[in-house]
């Protein structure tokens, strides 16, 4: 995470580390069941076989996990099946849901974020030397409307609709390379939601180009039905 | 439907060179790893080696490295087995395989296989 | 590379009755394997993976079982369409089939 700032430790109870076999961060992921991690596709081009992935959670540190950490294999990799960048992993053993193991909540099918609502981004990523390199950082993040994003002077009609937008316009805070397949959420009445993925940029904070996310309320049917038959 | 179905098999010398292609369809061709698998007769089931969707990576087993050159085609929606210097024991049922069920977990989708036959 | 010792090679067993085939890797797999059916003239069919976990449309009476490096895969009340080689095939690292076993009804 570029800017933003270092997060309370454990303040994202369902922020993943995807990591390879030899315990190398790449990019992140969301607990959404005790079985489950959504993250992106573009992270499981590295490797087709399960056994390349392992997933940690409940860390702040990126590299001097703490004892309470759980470090679990992935037994299976599903791929959302019309080329959007969003996959499933499926946990070889339940996560232990405790104080900082805890799915995130997905939202309803189809839910569309207002323009303007303030989400979160966390994630271990580049930082392009803003403060806070090894640690999980957070940075709020206003959605962006896609007909704003699509503007020629922003993305230009690169943003598709099962995709979001989020960002300050004046740049200097974004996702980065390394955050890719973690979250974005939102705070909705009394608890955050899973609204995005995060996905790709131009760069990384840079003026005008915000980072885009893929929207999780366009594939709720297509995560639950594969938790269901798998 | 997924369809994988392999080509170019046949009588070749030794020494000679062969490629053989497979062609896919019925699913995202371009996302996905492909690998061939070889079968000589009366014997058991051996991988040959993978490619990934962009052709960036390409693993091979060891043993048949230096003899064989795995590439792809997305455009074409095909894979193909370009085999060098063989040798009698490259007389095999040659299939191609993937990973058809939007899931990667084993090789789930097969063709039925190209045979070749190495003889002078 | 990891080498995949499956047996027995061959085995006969009667309508309606149980067989077990086994394989053993030359290190720990992780659990990361699967079980095909090949008959002539067809690719394989993938039955399980990740040791025991039956793929969408495959009977119960296939089952697998196992963990580090020995594995087992069984099939009950034998049915004459289960006359086929079966294979084991580690994807810990990279993929290896064990030898086959060559299944006949008596």
């Known amino acids: 995470v570029v800017g933003g700032c270092v997060a309370h430790p454990h303040s994202w109870p369902w922020q993943v580390s995807l990591r390879t076999r030899f315990g190398m961060h790449f990019c992140g992921g969301t607990l959404i069941s005790p079985e489950w991690v959504l993250t992106a596709a573009h992270c499981l081009e590295k490797s087709p076989r399960p056994s390349s992935y392992k997933v940690i959670l409940g860390a702040h540190q990126e590299v001097n996990l703490e004892p309470h950490v759980q470090e679990i294999e992935v037994s299976r990799l599903f791929l959302e099946p019309t080329r959007k960048d969003i996959a499933l992993l499926k946990l070889s053993s339940p996560a232990v849901i405790t104080d900082k193991v805890i799915p995130a909540c997905l939202p309803s099918p189809n839910y569309v974020v207002a323009d303007r609502t303030e989400c979160f981004i966390t994630g271990w990523g580049e930082t392009q030397g803003t403060f806070g390199a090894g640690l999980l950082k957070e940075a709020q993040l206003p959605v962006i409307e896609n007909k704003v994003c699509n503007r020629y002077e922003f993305l230009n009609g690169r943003v598709q609709s099962t995709e979001l937008c989020a960002g300050h316009l004046a740049g200097g805070t974004d996702s980065c390379q390394g955050d890719s397949g973690g979250p974005l959420v939102c705070f909705e009445k009394d608890k955050y939601i899973l609204q995005g993925v995060t996905s790709w940029g131009l760069g990384c904070a840079r003026p005008n180009k915000p980072g885009v996310y893929v929207r999780v309320s366009r594939f709720v049917t297509w995560i639950e039905g594969v938790m269901r038959n798998n | 439907e997924v369809k994988l179905l392999e080509s170019g098999g046949g009588l070749v010398q030794p020494g000679g060179s062969l490629k053989l292609s497979c062609a896919a369809s019925?699913?995202?061709?371009?996302?996905?790893?492909m690998s061939w698998v070889r079968q000589a007769p009366g014997k058991g089931l051996e991988w040959i080696g993978e490619i990934n969707p962009d052709s960036s990576t390409i693993n091979y087993t060891p043993s048949l490295k230096d003899k064989f050159i795995i590439s792809r085609d997305n455009a074409k929606n095909s894979l193909y087995l370009q085999m060098s210097k063989v040798r009698s024991e490259d007389t095999a049922l040659y299939y191609c395989?993937?990973?058809?069920?939007?899931?990667?977990?084993?090789?789930?989708?097969w063709g039925q296989g190209t045979s070749v036959t190495v003889s002078s | 590379d990891i080498q995949m010792t499956q047996s027995p090679s061959s085995l006969s067993a009667s309508l309606g009755g149980k067989v077990s085939i086994t394989c053993k890797a030359s290190?720990?797999?992780?659990?990361?394997i699967s079980w095909y059916q090949h008959k002539p003239g067809k690719g394989p069919r993938l039955l399980i993976h990740y040791t025991s976990t039956l793929q969408p449309g495959i009977p119960s009476r296939f089952s697998g079982s196992g963990s580090g490096r020995d594995y087992s895969f069984s099939i009950s009340n034998l049915e004459p369409e289960d006359i086929a080689t079966y294979y084991c095939?580690?994807?810990?690292?990279?993929?290896?089939f064990g030898g086959g076993t060559k299944l006949e009804i008596k």
């Open positions: 290190q720990d797999i992780n659990k990361y």
């Open positions: 395989a993937s990973y058809c069920g939007y899931s990667y977990d084993a090789l789930d989708c």
């Open positions: 019925g699913f995202d061709f371009s996302r996905y790893w």
């Open positions: 095939l580690q994807y810990d690292n990279l993929y290896t």
